[in-house]
């Protein structure tokens, strides 16, 4: 579903933007703190990023600016969502279950940040 | 730690090798059916990767190279696990959380499968 | 938009090797499986294989194996297909196609490369 | 390997015509078929996946149906666009295999 994907990208193109244009309102809370994973495997991440989010909008004052930006990050979440819902959907044959292993362990081998 | 890395970029690559080895043996039940992700983003699906890998064990039959192959792939769960408890192990400044959360969203943008 | 360009006709002699490639576009490259799959003039179609652009992985019908290598050139967005021994009932149009998702539907397929072989 | 049997080779229908093709598996796949259509000289072109899902952009007159090894494609009513060849693939288990096509003519 090209389209989709087309306006999950410009979304989340939107939310980047409107993250840095309201940086300085969004850490006016000196005092506050919020998980940080210590590593960069983002996708191993997503519940504590997701409810860094939701600290992080019940401590913020909203504005119109804010509202939207949180909105989208919440549209994001449910994509997310959707994607892990998919990961159990499908009964395949060992054959596939295999290539699909075989490429999750490359990936791993080359992309994670695997320290520590 | 380097050495840790160092080791577990050595046990994936084994794991790979010792998966295209013993592939026609792990195969051999042509009435198995496991979930297969639907899409590419494989940490999104590390459970569900990792209860194929067990249904895949309690219906093979086990010999000392598959021992072997299944010993390893419980070693590297266990260096995800380990990497999934540092998700939330610390509490940073909002500053920091929005760098992660910036980056975050940069990294669905242009590495994630998000088609559908 | 999401496009897959495959090179132009060949004419081989029998014995030879043909490499048709299919250049993607409009998506990244790595996230999607390219599958081959042939038609001789008024037959049906054929499937030779798949290559994970990935990892480089490919899997092949028994029937083209030792025959037929899949490869992809990732810095190009590139697959390749090369038959080689060819023979004359290798005379087909070759078409390359996009894997939706993991081992999924074709939703996106080349134009076809007509390949005949003739000596 | 999975052999796929379509019929009929052939139909003659007319515009405005319901037009059913089958297509049988010689094993279980589950419901990993896809519909598929081809215009003389061109491309194939995916119409329906997962045995009864229409793509986007496909007209709904097309619909598909069945799982196991018995599957259908309907056109509820041919439209002139619609006279081709269609075939069925299933993707349940390598190497991937086709049904050997139905042709749609006009009457």
């Known amino acids: 579903i090209p389209k989709q994907s087309a306006t999950l990208r410009a979304l989340v193109r939107e939310t980047l933007t409107l993250l840095s244009t309201h940086r300085t309102l969004l850490k006016g809370n000196e005092t506050l703190r919020i998980s940080v994973p210590a590593h960069k495997n983002h996708q191993l991440c997503i519940e504590e990023i997701f409810q860094g989010i939701d600290t992080l909008k019940n401590q913020t004052t909203q504005g119109e600016a804010l509202a939207t930006l949180f909105q989208n990050l919440s549209l994001i979440k449910k994509h997310i969502d959707l994607q892990k819902q998919k990961c159990g959907e499908e009964r395949r044959r060992v054959k596939q279950f295999l290539d699909y292993l075989q490429e999750f362990l490359a990936v791993i081998n080359t992309e994670w940040t695997i320290e520590g | 730690i380097p050495k840790q890395s160092a080791t577990l970029r050595a046990l994936v690559r084994e794991t790979l090798t010792l998966l295209s080895t013993h592939r026609t043996l792990l195969k051999g039940n042509e009435t198995l059916r496991i979930s297969v992700p639907a899409h590419k983003n494989h940490q999104l699906c590390i459970e569900e990767i990792f209860q194929g890998i067990d249904t895949l064990k309690n219906q093979t039959t086990q010999g000392e190279a598959l021992a072997t192959l299944f010993q390893n792939l419980s070693l590297i769960k266990k260096h995800i696990d380990l990497q999934k408890q540092k998700c939330g192990e610390e509490r940073r400044r909002v500053k920091q959380f929005l760098d992660y959360l910036q980056e975050f969203l940069a990294v669905i943008n242009t590495e994630w499968t998000i088609e559908g | 938009q999401v496009q897959l360009v495959q090179s132009g006709a060949e004419v081989k002699k029998p014995g030879a090797s043909v490499k048709v490639s299919c250049k993607a576009s409009g998506y990244t490259f790595t996230n999607h499986h390219i599958n081959w799959v042939r038609q001789a003039p008024g037959q049906g179609l054929e499937w030779i294989g798949y290559?994970?652009?990935?990892?480089?992985?490919?899997r092949y019908n028994q029937k083209f194996k030792g025959r037929a290598t899949l490869t992809v050139d990732k810095s190009t967005s590139t697959a390749y297909m090369e038959l080689s021994s060819l023979r004359s009932e290798d005379t087909a149009v070759y078409y390359c196609?996009?894997?939706?998702?993991?081992?999924?539907?074709?939703?996106?397929w080349g134009q076809g490369t007509l390949v005949t072989v003739s000596s | 390997d999975i052999q796929m049997t379509q019929s009929p080779s052939s139909l003659s229908a007319s515009v405005g015509d319901r037009v059913t093709i089958t297509c049988k598996a010689s094993q279980d796949i589950n419901s990993y078929l896809s519909w598929i259509q081809q215009k003389p000289g061109k491309a194939p072109k995916t119409l329906i996946h997962?045995?009864?899902r229409l793509i986007d952009g496909v007209p709904s007159r097309f619909s598909g149906s069945g799982s196991g090894q018995d599957f259908t494609l309907t056109i509820s009513s041919l439209q002139p666009e619609d006279f081709a060849t269609y075939y069925c693939?299933?993707?349940?288990?390598?190497?991937?295999?086709f049904g050997q096509g139905t042709k749609v003519e006009i009457k």
């Open positions: 196609a996009r894997d939706y998702g993991n081992f999924w539907y074709f939703d996106v």
């Open positions: 997962r045995a009864d």
């Open positions: 290559i994970n652009p990935y990892n480089d992985y490919s």
């Open positions: 693939l299933q993707y349940d288990d390598f190497p991937y295999t």
